[in-house]
């Protein structure tokens, strides 16, 4: 089990994967993407309380220093640990193309 | 040059590398680290305004969605893009050992 997977703030409130619906207009993609018309963006959202899903030693240090110097050092932040590929059908000069993006959808989250 | 390296909030206010001095006591390391007595921790601190040092497409999406749904989607966060190794002299059962940690000091920062 990963370091600190229990959320002390209540279920669903700590750093985890979350799906956010977005239209092509929301993303500013309407002029170059044909499909999908809406995107399910998986992203990392939630608080990073002490040692919750700490990514590495740097994250552990950050937690300690945030406790001591909260005005200077921010708390660790919930960010993607890895990504899932996403396929878009794009408009091109000659027609359309199927394009895969490897850094668009979060797959797993941690605190850093 | 990296995407969006100009800080619109004023010099030094956006995501960048900072050095924070910390004692072994601050870090809770006093019982297992002999040297150094103080650590110069390099960490990533600062705001991530629109497209500033965006790490990838996910970060760009996050910026767009934060603008639309600020209660749900946080702004991108300033985190290490890479690390520098750090050597600690540790206490062991038999004496001391020299240990290198690869994920302790931030080397470079980006927004994600």
């Amino acid at each position: 089990a990963r370091n600190g997977d229990h959320c002390p703030l209540g279920p669903g409130r700590c750093c985890r994967l979350h799906t956010v619906r977005a239209s092509l207009e929301d993303l500013g993609w309407a002029d170059w993407v044909l499909s999908p018309r809406e995107v399910q963006v998986t992203m990392c959202i939630g608080a990073c309380p002490s040692q919750f899903r700490a990514a590495n030693m740097h994250a552990q240090i950050k937690t300690s220093l945030h406790r001591l110097k909260p005005d200077t050092v921010p708390a660790p932040c919930c960010v993607p640990a890895s990504y899932n590929p996403m396929v878009l059908i794009q408009k091109t000069d000659t027609g359309v193309s199927l394009q895969t993006y490897d850094d668009l959808l979060a797959k797993d989250c941690h605190c850093i | 040059a990296r995407n969006g390296d100009h800080c619109p909030l004023g010099p030094g206010r956006c995501c960048r590398l900072h050095t924070v001095r910390a004692s072994l006591e601050d870090l809770g390391w006093a019982d297992w680290v002999l040297s150094p007595r103080e650590v110069q921790v390099t960490m990533c601190i600062g705001a991530c305004p629109s497209q500033f040092r965006a790490a990838n497409m996910h970060a760009q999406i996050k910026t767009s969605l934060h603008r639309l749904k600020p209660d749900t989607v946080p702004a991108p966060c300033c985190v290490p893009a890479s690390y520098n190794p750090m050597v600690l002299i540790q206490k062991t059962d038999t004496g001391v050992s020299l240990q290198t940690y690869d994920d302790l000091l931030a080397k470079d920062c980006h927004c994600i």
Epitope: L17, T19, V20, L88 | K69
Partner: antibody, heavy 114, light 110 residues
Framework: QSVKESGGRLVTPGTPLTLTCKAS????????MSWVRQAPGKGLEWIGT??????GTWYASWVKGRFTISKTSTTVDLKMTSLTTEDTATYFC??????????WGPGTLVTVSS | DIVLTQTAASVSEPVGGTVTIKCQAS??????LAWYQQKPGQPPKLLIY???DLASGVPSRFKGSGYGTEFTLTISGVQCGDAATYYC????????????FGGGTEVVVK
């Protein structure tokens, strides 16, 4: 744009069965697709979801490996094993879950009986 | 998986009245909630997505509200054609949540 399920039939307990969902008017490769079931006179029950772009899957905890969602270039399939009478239901294919224009198929009936 | 609880299994309201259906999530899901209407023999029809956004073609008397763990579907000026079963669904695809449905609330119009 529409989806249609097929493959539902009467089977005996323990018989494996595969249901197929075919999409019309849109490219499966860019959408999330789900399977949902509804036992006679009961509520809706989410089975699982696949992102056809990557093949990534999510399942309800009760599935416990008995059902598998997979994709081909033109279909999304639901493979079911170790069927029991409790699995008797109408099975729906859905373009979703989280689209403002979620599309549901008419459903296909699976009856498990000895 | 997340649990969605629809407190009332059935509600009855005269034509023109207001129906309120509640849905409570066992964990914090922000605005990741949809509401569906289902009539006998038909697949469900999407009414509300993202907790409060009205799906295309749905009359404005249907209103979704809520955020986090508490959600509500309100039907104002209820009509005979609104008699159906209403389900909430978590639309978050995280590993801990899943796209669970609530147990459903039957609306009877008198």
């Amino acid at each position: 744009q529409s989806v249609k399920e097929s493959g539902g039939r009467l089977v005996t307990p323990g018989t494996p069965l595969t249901l197929t969902c075919k999409a019309s008017g849109f490219s499966l490769s860019t959408y999330w697709m789900s399977w949902v079931r509804q036992a006679p006179g009961k509520g809706l029950e989410w089975i699982g979801t696949i992102y056809a772009g990557s093949g990534g899957t999510w399942y309800a905890s009760w599935v416990k490996g008995r059902f598998t969602i997979s994709k081909t270039s033109t279909t999304v399939d639901l493979k079911m094993t170790s069927l029991t009478t409790e699995d008797t239901a109408t099975y729906f294919c859905v373009r979703g879950p989280n689209y403002s224009d979620a599309i549901w198929g008419p459903g296909t009936l699976v009856t498990v009986s000895s | 998986d997340i649990v969605l609880t629809q407190t009332a299994a059935s509600v009855s309201e005269p034509v023109g009245g207001t129906v309120t259906i509640k849905c409570q999530a066992s964990e914090y899901i922000y605005s990741s909630l949809a509401w569906y209407q289902q009539k006998p023999g038909q697949p469900p029809k999407l009414l509300i997505y993202d907790a409060s956004d009205l799906a295309s073609g749905v009359p404005s008397r249907f209103k979704g509200s809520g955020y986090g763990t508490e959600f509500t579907l309100t039907i104002s000026g209820v009509q005979c054609g609104d008699a159906a079963t209403y389900y909430c669904q978590c639309t978050d695809l995280s590993s801990s949540a899943g796209n669970t449905f609530g147990g459903g609330t039957e609306v009877v119009v008198k």
